[in-house]
Interface confidence: low
């Protein structure tokens, strides 16, 4: 059976980074559908990172709706029974099985648009989404391994003499912490049941000519650097500054 794959040149586009306003899509427009129709033979599952609290649109293979018999979206989320949303063109009827998340809906009426939307993506939307289009020419598939990205909250503080602690709290996936200049560091990771990870890096600098240190946090949602002046007095507190 044939299957559709996304155009390799397509890029994930995010319009804004504001909560609940940003919108991500891997969909092709009608021109791309026409241009790429002859190339869409091999089934490909796309790994797709999506920022939490954005809106995501997942697309079916670029098959003209006039050639359609049945569209089925299969949604497999962690700890949930498989949910299916189906549309049968002949009877113009939609059917849902085991679908409880009201944020996951058809973009519009499925006879007009077969795409699926997730409104305000949450951690619980991590999972596998597959569109199966049944046509007279065969079945066409497109699958997405959706990875929800959560921006960690970054803090930096000095807790002892010439020792600083940098924390990237509740990120998904885990953030990476590096220091300038390098110190004597220990890094711990705390895993949460919802899939987020808190990374804590504690560093000590013996060299007394080091007065300012920078914590750099790298994450798929973006990087952040904070710096702090090391205080020689034990127990003194100093707040971090953002670059």
């Amino acid at each position: 059976e044939g299957a559709a794959q996304p155009n390799n040149s397509l890029m994930l586009q995010t319009s804004k980074e504001n909560h609940a306003l940003a919108s991500s899509s891997l969909c092709m427009d009608e021109k791309q559908i026409t241009q790429n129709y002859s190339k869409v033979l091999a089934e490909v599952n796309t790994s797709w990172p999506v920022k939490m609290a954005t809106n995501a649109v997942l697309c079916c293979p670029p098959i003209a709706l006039r050639n359609l018999i049945i569209i089925t979206w299969e949604i497999i989320l962690r700890g949930q029974p498989s949910c299916t949303k189906a549309y049968k063109k002949e009877t113009n009827e939609t059917k849902e099985t085991n679908c409880t998340d009201e944020r996951i809906t058809w973009v519009s009426r499925p006879d007009q648009n077969s795409d699926l939307q997730i409104r305000t993506v949450a951690i619980t939307h991590d999972g596998y989404y597959r569109c199966i289009m049944v046509t007279p020419d065969g079945n066409f598939h497109r699958g997405y391994h959706l990875q929800v990205l959560v921006t960690p909250e970054v803090t930096l503080f000095q807790n002892r003499n010439r020792t600083a602690v940098c924390k990237a709290v509740a990120g998904k996936p885990a953030a990476h912490i590096s220091w300038i200049p390098e110190g004597d560091c220990a890094t711990k990771q705390e895993y949460w049941s919802n899939g987020t990870v808190t990374v804590k890096s504690t560093c000590h600098w013996e060299v007394h000519n080091v007065s300012t240190v920078t914590c750099h946090v790298s994450h798929l949602t973006g990087n952040k650097s904070l710096y702090i002046e090391l205080l020689p007095v034990p127990g003194a507190k100093k707040s971090a500054k953002l670059y």
Partner: antibody, heavy 119, light 110 residues
Framework: EVQLLESGGGLVQPGGSLRLSCAAS????????MSWVRQAPGKGLEWVSA????????YYADSVKGRFTISRDNSKNTLYLQMNSLRAEDTAVYYC????????????WGQGTLVTVSS | QSVLTQPPSASGTPGQRVTISCTGS????????VTWYQQLPGTAPKLLIY???HRPSGVPDRFSGSKSGTSASLAISGLRSEDEADYYC???????????FGGGTKLTVL
């Protein structure tokens, strides 16, 4: 069926402490952020505090910062609010509420527990 | 004083359309999802509209939400006596790192 049941309210003197609990059932507790919202008699809703799914991120309204502590025990499906240094203006019905994420809506609410701070 | 501003009261007759406004700023309504809650007398609040304009299942399509810039509106068409309640708008405030409510609007069905 999603259920949130608050307990621990009552009459307390100014400066006193109370610990509210919210027992959750009917859903996977650790998949949701939780919040406390209060409503003084005859007044509007006021958000008090929120905690992320795993409990690592906590947020507080300025009016309770330093006095109230939110926590959760995912193994017991329970949300807590430790209230210290209580004032007369903390008198309210306290609701616990569930949300998909901290910054989003509360899709389910408990029925509330009344806290009265008075001498 | 509430961070989000709502009219304290609104009224209408059965069958009418009523609109309740909610005004905020770029740190809340402007850049975050707006939610509306309905609180019937003597009961806990109930989710009415989320993500600016989406209805949970079970909420009649007489209720609709909209947002433009730093303002949001709740519209109730075909007003019924059972719609008599307090209505609250709310949103996350990125500057405060907290959730903010409007002062509430008491809707009276005449």
């Amino acid at each position: 069926e999603v259920q949130l049941l608050e307990s621990g309210g009552g009459l307390v003197q100014p400066g006193g402490s109370l610990r509210l609990s919210c027992a959750a059932s009917g859903f996977t507790f650790s998949d949701y952020a939780m919040s406390w919202v209060r409503q003084a008699p005859g007044k509007g809703l006021e958000w008090v505090s929120a905690i992320s799914h795993g409990g690592s991120s906590k947020y507080y309204a300025d009016s309770v910062k330093g006095r109230f502590t939110i926590s959760r025990d995912n193994s017991k499906n329970t949300l807590y609010l430790q209230m210290n240094s209580l004032r007369a203006e903390d008198t309210a019905v306290y609701y616990c509420a569930r949300g998909p994420e901290v910054m989003l809506e509360f899709d389910y609410w408990g029925q509330g527990t009344l806290v009265t701070v008075s001498s | 004083q509430s961070v989000l501003t709502q009219p304290p009261s609104a009224s209408g007759t059965p069958g009418q359309r009523v609109t309740i406004s909610c005004t905020g700023s770029s740190s809340n309504i402007g850049n975050n999802a707006v939610t509306w809650y309905q609180q019937l007398p003597g009961t806990a609040p109930k989710l009415l509209i989320y993500s600016d304009n989406h209805r949970p299942s079970g909420v009649p399509d007489r209720f609709s939400g909209s947002k433009s810039g730093t303002s949001a509106s709740l519209a109730i068409s075909g007003l019924r006596s059972e719609d008599e309640a307090d209505y609250y708008c709310a949103a996350w405030d990125s500057s405060l790192s907290g959730y903010v409510f409007g002062g509430g609007t008491k809707l009276t069905v005449l």
